[in-house]
Interface confidence: low
């Protein structure tokens, strides 16, 4: 038998969970204007068409999508991160970056929320995404859970403005495939994902042509065995 | 057995209103979100506007420019659909659905239909 054979009777016997599947956002978006952030989150008060939402219903449909496990979001995590008292805090000697575990001199952000979402408003939300993504999780008991350090670090890009301004790039969402075990399922997984992504940029550009701002982004999936099987999906037309 | 009946359909002139109304029975309204879509002739099912269990949320299709309205009233297990400054291309059957998660109507359809309700726009 080949190594292909070998591991796929491996996958077979032994894997519960399939290869790790980005969806990439591409930059362009203000993730600090609420309209847009309603675009990307999966709570309250965010579109029902929104990327997340769309993911998880991709979730909820994995025979034809392969897709085990939700890509969670960083911006929701972020938004319940700002919204804890304690989770937020810097140095007062040159506003710089403080875990959360750490007491005095440390102090608490004290974000201010707007509105019925109850979010940062644009200055802040753009202030603390850095201080939310170097932010380590808490599970001692403090409620900071939330920290995006570890989920979310290599996700978020940010380029920073006037030494305390954020604005977010590219970005990308991570959730899993289902258990692949042929070269079917691992072709048929690429062009479920290659769907998913197609409607996301569908929906994400008629949404931004509302918005009248003129720009345009791009979704796509990525995966490590992705390169190894993007023939399949031409092959016949490819002959012919 | 969940149900749900529409009303207040017909043939009404550009520029004219119309209400419709989704009576639904055999469950209990306030645990379920209800959304409002329409399918023209020749054309897809499309989504129109949804409101969640309690009233508090709603939310409407882009291309509806601010003219319908969507209401509902839990005690009379009711839910309405105020259409205002009705045009031509509004022309379709409209649909009451109910399901649990208000935030995926648009992307996932809903478990429980109604028959519909012919609306035409018509001089």
């Known amino acids: 038998d080949s190594f292909q054979t070998k591991y796929f009777q491996y996958l077979n016997r032994y894997l519960n969970i399939g290869p790790p599947v980005y969806f990439v956002v591409t930059e362009g978006l203000n993730y600090s204007d609420m309209d847009t952030q309603n675009m990307i989150c999966g709570t309250r008060f965010c579109r029902p068409d929104s990327l997340s939402m769309q993911l998880y219903a991709a979730y909820r449909n994995p025979n034809e999508t392969y897709i085990a496990q939700p890509p969670n979001s960083w911006l929701d995590d972020y938004f319940d991160w700002s919204a804890l008292p304690n989770c937020c805090k810097y140095f007062p000697s040159n506003s710089s970056f403080c875990p959360n575990d750490r007491g005095a001199p440390c102090k608490a952000c004290g974000i201010a929320l707007e509105g019925d979402e109850q979010r940062p408003n644009s200055t802040e939300f753009e202030r603390y995404v850095p201080f939310f993504l170097q932010d380590i999780p808490d599970t001692s008991g403090s409620g900071c859970v939330k920290g995006g350090h570890a989920a979310y670090g290599q996700a978020v890009n940010y380029k920073m403005f006037n030494k305390t301004q954020a604005h977010v790039g590219a970005t990308y969402y991570q959730g899993y495939h289902t258990v692949l075990k042929t070269s079917l399922d691992y072709y048929s997984a690429l062009k479920g994902a290659r769907e998913v992504a197609a409607n996301l940029t569908e929906t994400l550009n008629r949404n931004l042509k509302h918005q009248l701002n003129g720009t345009t982004i791009n979704v796509f999936p990525y995966s490590v065995f992705y390169v190894f099987y993007e023939q399949y999906l031409t092959m016949w037309p490819d002959t012919l | 057995q969940v149900q749900l009946q529409e009303s207040g359909g017909g043939l009404v002139q550009p520029g004219g209103s119309l209400r419709l109304s989704c009576a639904a029975s055999?469950?209990?309204?306030?645990?379920?979100?209800i959304g409002w879509f329409r399918q023209a002739p020749g054309k897809e099912r499309s989504f129109v506007a949804a409101i969640d269990s309690n009233g508090s949320n709603t939310y409407y299709a882009d291309s509806l420019k601010g003219r319908f309205t969507i209401a509902r009233d839990n005690a009379k297990s009711m839910v309405f659909l105020r259409m205002n400054n009705l045009e031509p291309e509004d022309t379709a059957v409209y649909y009451c659905a109910a399901g649990q998660n208000f935030w995926t109507f648009t992307t996932t359809p809903p478990p429980y239909w109604g028959q519909g309700t012919q609306v035409t726009v018509s001089s």
């Open positions: 055999g469950f209990t309204l306030d645990d379920y979100a």
